[in-house]
């Protein structure tokens, strides 16, 4: 029997029942490699509470339709005296990425999963040349899911201070260059997930091979390699490779674009601080609404409730299904059953079954998926209680006044599946707007001006034109709504600019579009403020002008006009200056534009070194000073010792010259032991220091790539700017 979803075959997938602390391993084409589940288990359940394993689906006992996959077992289960067998059921829905199997629910006998994936789509429109699993569970069974970062067309430009090259990447899949309007990517070879553009040429420097890996709490790694042996002439004989480290920000504030932290010998190291690297919580509710502050999610399905005897009707070939949400179906022949989903046989309308009761409901939001489960319905002949699973999809243009209607998609062993497109399933997710601008390879970053939460305060604009009696206070935040504190406490919730006077407060505009580079300055436009008459809404323009070293000065009101419909502010600030590389001495570096000074001398070991262990080697490194360890040259800043026999190499002479670019501090040691290549290139070491406020001194990590690239990454609080 051919595998039903070949794209999903190469991997063993994971799903989690968080409530019961159960981890499922799923291999839909073969068997999972877990001894305790036996040699032919396709779905292996690991109960972490009892530390037991059970096979709940056998690869040999597989049956499939276009959208459902069932794995039976030979194990009996106790369900009201029947001799039913334990089984797993996976409902497939079309998605835009390979996606992830989601645990839905489990009864005594059946373990239900749902999987939104390109593999289930009728058309190949979303299918990739190469895609790998893009999620991972941590030790606490919390899910880290990067699927939302996958670009279906185009790519992310990696931030780098080198003006001559541009590195474009996608996450977990190759770059679709055909559907991308940008001309730069057109030349990228097919299958590449990391494309290096140099002038008019584009090179494949990495393709996805393995899925996402969790290396530490809230730190994920994705590796791309170049499959074919052909070497690139600018790589000094090395095979290119790309490592992307996704870091969950220690606070909500620090999301960034991907940054290149090292690139010697075509080993590209990228760091990406993103909230998607944080664990995603599963939200559940027994009512018809749920909200989660951390996820910035608020859902209310009560407007979908039907009253006055009407229900939603969904056609299921042999049966009609009458549904209601947030209440029971009120049609005549169902109303004794307290059913939320009522199943009526078309050929004999006296045959009526409750396919789920409204007081037995679970509403779940998980990783962008909204599911409503009604269980505890009438029993089937097998002894199962009928149950219904409704998968909601956001559709802002749904019919029926935005409510939409449920559509029956299939049945597995007395579980009925529906999809429902409705505007009420549209979840308010976090903003994806950038707080910066680009001009070719020049980058501008306004995030230093953002005020996030107390004890920080809003920026207050200076307005010299007013007398004290008629004084208006203008509160401004950048790329963020104003904080409702102090005099701005009464400001409208989503205002990014707010005017407060004795009559109250006014929304002068919301953050709806990213900043733009215009005429040498940065323009930030806030629109959709309060009404200002004639059906118009207040709009505010902020012009940010580069002023190196100044992050303290406040914005100034320049004009207001159009009958109170337009406000213009000017702001002289270091945040509007182009990001550039700066060099420093004596283990310090000063970011003159942002006004930050960094001193890494506390990391220097007066005697000794930091030891970094890999399988084959010990590395001894120091910061801004020499290592003093017996095998190592006294003036080397980094040194490599073979574990097996203490062969040693000097990886570069120590110095204290730091360089700084966009939140990244680097230290380069050069002039080490020459390689045995034709050019006898001296070995060199690059240490990249990155901010982690919780790390203290931190420790160096070797970016293990090949035998001749010595990149270390070091998360430390000493690389963090002082809070303004």
């Amino acid at each position: 029997q051919a595998a039903p979803f070949p794209e999903l075959c190469s991997y063993t997938w994971e799903a989690v029942d968080t409530k019961n602390n159960v981890l499922y391993k799923i291999n839909i084409c073969g068997s999972v490699d877990i001894v305790q589940c036996g040699p032919s288990s396709a779905v292996c359940m690991h109960d972490l509470k009892t530390r037991t394993y059970h096979s709940v689906g056998d690869s040999v006992l597989r049956s499939a339709t276009r959208s459902l996959l069932e794995f039976n077992t030979t194990v009996s289960c106790d369900q009201q005296g029947t001799n039913h067998r334990v089984q797993s059921s996976i409902a497939f829905l079309c998605g835009k990425t390979l996606g992830t199997p989601e645990f839905v629910t489990a009864t005594e006998c059946v373990h239900y999963f749902e999987w939104r994936t390109t593999a289930a789509c009728k058309k190949d429109i979303f299918k990739a040349n190469k895609e790998v699993p893009c999620y991972v569970f941590d030790e606490e069974l919390r899910k880290h899911d990067l699927n939302p970062l996958i670009k279906l067309s185009g790519a992310y430009l990696v931030d780098d201070s080198d003006p001559d090259t541009s590195l474009f990447i996608n996450v977990c899949r190759d770059i679709d260059t055909l559907r991308d309007p940008g001309s730069q990517l057109r030349a990228c070879p097919p299958g590449t997930a990391a494309c290096l553009v140099r002038g008019h040429q584009a090179f494949d420097v990495g393709q996805p091979r393995d899925g996402l890996k969790l290396v530490r709490k809230d730190r994920l790694v994705l590796s791309y390699v170049r499959e074919e042996a052909g070497k690139l002439d600018f790589c000094d004989g090395h095979s290119p490779a790309v490592t992307i480290t996704f870091v969950c920000p220690s606070e909500r504030r620090e999301g960034t674009i991907p940054k290149l932290t090292a690139k010697s010998n075509c080993r590209y190291e990228i760091e990406w601080i993103t909230e998607y690297a944080c664990h995603r919580d599963y939200l559940e509710s027994k009512t018809c609404s749920l909200s989660g502050e951390q996820q910035d999610v608020s859902i209310d399905l009560t407007p979908l409730a039907q009253s006055g005897g009407s229900s939603y009707i969904s056609d299921g070939k042999e049966y009609l299904f009458y549904l209601n949400v947030c209440g029971e179906t009120e049609i005549q022949f169902c109303n004794k059953k307290q059913a939320a989903v009522c199943q009526v046989k078309k050929s004999d309308t006296s045959q009526v079954k409750a396919a789920g009761r409204y007081h037995n409901q679970t509403l779940r939001y998980s990783d962008g998926d909204l599911t409503l489960i009604y269980f505890g319905g009438d029993e089937c002949s097998s002894g199962f209680q009928r149950m219904s699973v409704i998968n909601f999809e956001c559709n802002k243009t749904a019919g029926n006044d935005g409510k939409g209607t449920p559509v029956f998609t299939g049945e597995v062993d007395c579980t009925y599946f529906f999809t429902w497109d409705t505007e009420y399933a549209c979840v308010k997710e976090k903003e994806d707007l950038l707080c910066g601008a680009t001009d070719g390879k020049k980058r501008y970053d306004l995030s230093a001006l953002v005020r996030h939460a107390e004890p920080e305060q809003n920026w207050e604009a200076v307005d010299g034109s007013q007398t004290e009696t008629e004084k208006k206070h203008f509160f401004i935040n950048i790329c963020h709504r104003v904080l409702q504190e102090g005099k701005a406490r009464g400001c409208p919730e989503d205002a990014a600019v707010c005017a407060v006077d004795k009559n109250g407060s006014k929304n002068l505009g919301k953050f709806i579009s990213s900043p733009m580079k215009e005429k040498g300055n940065i323009q930030l436009s806030y629109s959709d403020g309060d009404d200002c008459g004639h059906g118009k809404k207040i709009k505010t323009n902020i012009t940010l002008v580069c002023k190196p070293g100044d992050l303290e000065s406040a914005p100034v009101l320049r004009t207001s006009g159009e009958g109170g419909c337009f406000y213009e502010f000017e702001w002289h600030t270091a945040a509007a200056c182009v990001l550039s590389k700066t060099e420093g001495e004596n283990c310090t570096v000063f970011d003159s534009q942002a006004g930050f000074s960094f001193d890494l001398s506390p990391l220097t070991k007066k005697n000794g070194a930091y030891k970094v262990e890999t399988k084959k080697y010990d590395f001894y490194i120091n910061v801004c000073g020499p290592v003093s360890v017996s095998p190592c040259q006294p003036d080397s800043g980094a040194c490599q010792v073979a574990k097996s026999d203490e062969k040693t190499w000097n990886l570069g002479l120590s110095n204290a010259k730091l360089s700084y670019y966009d939140g990244m501090i680097q230290l380069n040691y050069r002039g080490g032991t020459p390689y045995n290549n034709e050019r006898h290139t001296p070995r060199a070491t690059l240490i990249t220091f990155l901010c982690d406020r919780d790390a203290g001194v931190g420790f160096p990590e070797y970016q293990e790539e090949d035998n001749s690239t010595y990149n270390f990454r070091w998360y430390t609080s000493y690389a963090c700017p002082e809070e303004p």
Epitope: K605, N607, G608, A609, Y610, K611, D618, Y620, S628, V629, S630, P631, C632, Q633, P634, S636, C639, V641, K643, D645, E646, K647, T648, W649, N650, T673
Partner: antibody, heavy 116, light 109 residues
């Protein structure tokens, strides 16, 4: 097989000089740092000097107790390690060992006796 | 000058686990001390066991392991054998020189 063979020991008078040699075989000599260690009768070993490998510039280090009197050197073409000992004292009497790297491989030792 | 301190003697039985330690008079032993362990058998036969704190010399049985335990370097013999009866020396690196300890005599009864 790694082999280290010391020679050049013997009986000398205080104030005299002596040069110890160590013939190395079974490994690429220039890849490894080498040391001299001595052990007076009934006592613990005492590290004397090291000379690093080619990759680390053949730099040297000495125990403070012998610095200025003893010199470590190597002939990489012959795979020989040397210890030049000047102004010998009675307390320099010991068995002298040639050692590869961090004391992984030791020679059988050569006895040096300094006595009037 | 720093002093390296070892237990003078330890006794164990075949099959037992024994841990020897190596302390520095100047404070905690760290990976920068590049701790090494050597074994001396009768007739001044020296064999290197551990280099660089925890790297076993090739050919040395797996029952010998090096580590750092509570600010000290440690050599653990897991499942001691009669042929392990010997004197064990540790040496630590201090910026630019090695200093040996006085040795631990291990008896396997």
């Amino acid at each position: 097989e790694v082999k280290l063979m010391e020679s050049g020991g013997g009986l000398v008078q205080p104030g005299a000089s002596l040069r110890l040699s160590c013939a190395a075989s079974g490994f690429t000599f220039t890849d490894y740092y080498m040391s001299w260690v001595r052990q007076p009768p009934g006592k613990a070993p005492e590290w004397l000097a090291l000379i690093r490998n080619k990759a680390n510039g053949y730099t040297t280090e000495y125990n403070a107790s012998v610095k200025g009197r003893f010199t470590i050197s190597r002939d990489n073409s012959q795979n020989i390690l040397y210890l030049q000992m000047n102004t010998l004292r009675t307390e320099d009497s010991a068995t002298y060992y040639c050692v590869r790297g961090g004391f992984a491989y030791w020679g059988q030792g050569t006895l040096v006796t300094v006595s009037a | 000058q720093a002093v390296v301190i070892q237990e003078s003697a330890l006794t164990t039985s075949p099959g037992e686990t024994v841990t020897l330690t190596c302390r520095s008079s100047t404070g905690a032993v760290t990976t920068s001390h590049y701790a090494i362990w050597v074994q001396e058998k009768p007739d001044h036969l020296f064999t290197g066991l551990i280099g660089g704190t925890n790297n076993r010399v090739p050919g040395v049985p797996a029952r010998f392991s090096g580590s750092l335990i509570a600010d000290k370097a440690a050599l653990t013999i897991t499942g001691a054998q009669t042929e392990d009866e010997a004197i064990y020396f540790c040496a630590l690196w201090y910026t630019n020189q090695f200093i040996f300890g006085s040795g631990t005599k291990v008896t396997v009864l």
